[in-house]
């Protein structure tokens, strides 16, 4: 097996990802590892040269750059955190911060917009991941209420008075909790929504 | 370490425009978003917008987008802002600070402050 | 857009004193908070990051704490030194400065 550089009339290359033509001298060479730029052009008698990205620099895969690519930081302006540093192999990661989804993608997250409430008697229906999109409202199943706006309050079981030695004075709706009173106690006229005791 | 020149002042009169500069010693430009704060005569800070260096991409409050442009040169590790139009109230003190890799969630390093007169 | 607002917009003690400045957000922040310190005629200088987190070469007497929308910057014991404007600033969903406390000493 040839070993680079080496003659190819086809201009393609045996292994794509670590070998690339040359069109000038009508030569496979080999590309940079991860983490590595070209220091040195390959010829018909020399390989690649290559070479270690600098600090805060990187390439993150085999390539035949003669520059690394400049490490970014996450930009907090678009929404953004940090979730990995940059190394010379790999970009900076960054995420959407807590509260906010992914509203502009190009190949990464590029912005983030923070989620919609979910209004009374909703709330989020849960996504695979986290950050990917917009909140999307669901009611409250039966036997369950919300009672804020907000894009992250989930949806609570009402309160089983019974559980408490009280009965029900009110019962729950999707966005308020069951009214429990005291057995013994009448209910007076100004009740609402709370627990009498 | 990382440090940042701005010049002291700069006289300006209404209608016209003057460009502000700020110089990065120490450490990449390419590797950080440049910020410009505003201070006005005896009240706080206000965010102005940011530059990213490596492809001139800029973000600036509302307030701000018909006043100030943002600028930068790698090759000379400088920011620049430039501002329009001046008024009376553009009368401040405007400060250049960088997010950087180790710092991208606030501004460890301050230029100076240039302050900008607008007087006739 | 979410609001910063700082309490006591202006503050005299004595040294010695603790002293807790104010800053609350009109939503939550999730902690993303830095305080700065600003005295007549410099630039700004960070005190604490991420709430709680100390700037290297700021005096042990600083502290930060807080969640959601209500943050507090602590002085334990207050030196002549700290007389400054402190200023709180959020980078949730970018960049947003408070009013400003402006701490004199008696």
């Known amino acids: 097996q040839a070993v680079p550089p080496y003659a190819s009339e086809n201009q393609t290359c045996r292994d794509q990802e670590k070998e690339y033509y040359e069109p000038q001298h009508r030569i496979c060479c080999s590309r940079c590892p991860p983490g590595t730029y070209v220091s040195a052009k390959c010829s018909r008698i020399r390989d690649t040269v290559c070479a270690t990205c600098a600090e805060n620099s990187y390439n993150e895969h085999w390539n035949y750059l003669t520059i690394c690519q400049l490490c970014r930081p996450c930009d907090p302006v678009m929404g953004l955190e940090e979730i990995a540093p940059c190394t010379s192999k790999r970009k900076t990661q960054c995420r959407c911060q807590p509260g906010m989804f992914c509203a502009a993608w190009a190949l990464e997250c590029t912005h983030c917009e923070l989620l919609s409430d979910c209004p009374p008697g909703t709330e989020a229906e849960l996504k695979d991941e986290v950050g990917k999109g917009n909140n999307h409202c669901v009611p409250c199943k039966a036997g369950h209420f919300q009672n804020t706006s907000s894009p992250s309050a989930r949806c609570q079981p009402h309160t089983r008075c019974e559980n408490q030695g009280l009965v029900e004075a009110a019962p729950g709706t999707a966005q308020s909790d069951t009214t429990c009173k005291n057995p013994l106690e009448p209910l007076p006229p100004e009740m609402s929504g709370t627990m009498l005791m | 370490e990382v440090q940042l020149q701005q010049y002291g002042a700069e006289l300006g009169k209404p209608g016209t425009s003057v460009k502000l500069s700020c110089k990065v010693s120490?450490?990449?430009?390419?590797?950080?978003?440049i910020h410009w704060v505003i201070q006005r005569p005896g009240k706080g800070l206000e965010w102005i917008g940011r530059?990213?260096?490596?492809?001139?991409?800029?973000i600036s409050t509302e307030k701000f987008k018909n006043k100030a442009t943002l600028t930068a040169d790698l090759s000379s590790n400088t920011a620049y802002m430039q501002l329009s139009q001046l008024k009376s109230d553009d009368t401040a003190i405007y400060f250049c600070?960088?997010?950087?890799?180790?710092?991208?969630?606030?501004?460890?390093?301050w230029g100076q402050g240039t302050l900008v007169t607008v007087s006739s | 857009d979410i609001q910063m607002t700082q309490s006591p917009s202006q503050l005299s003690a004595s040294v010695g004193d603790r002293v807790t400045l104010s800053c609350k957000a009109s939503?939550?922040?999730?902690?993303?908070l830095n305080w700065y310190q600003q005295k007549l005629g410099e630039a700004p200088r960070l005190l604490i990051y991420?709430?709680?987190i100390l700037q290297t070469g700021i005096p042990s007497r600083f502290s930060g704490s807080g969640s959601g929308t209500d943050y507090t910057l602590t002085i334990s014991s207050l030196q002549p030194e700290d007389a400054a404007t402190y200023f709180c600033?959020?980078?949730?969903?970018?960049?947003?400065f408070g009013s400003g406390t402006k701490l004199e000493m008696k």
């Open positions: 600070a960088p997010t950087t890799l180790t710092t991208p969630d606030s501004f460890a390093y």
């Open positions: 120490g450490y990449n430009i390419g590797n950080t978003y």
């Open positions: 530059i990213d260096p490596t492809n001139g991409n800029t």
């Open positions: 939503q939550n922040i999730y902690k993303y």
């Open positions: 991420s709430t709680n």
């Open positions: 600033q959020k980078y949730y969903s970018g960049f947003t």
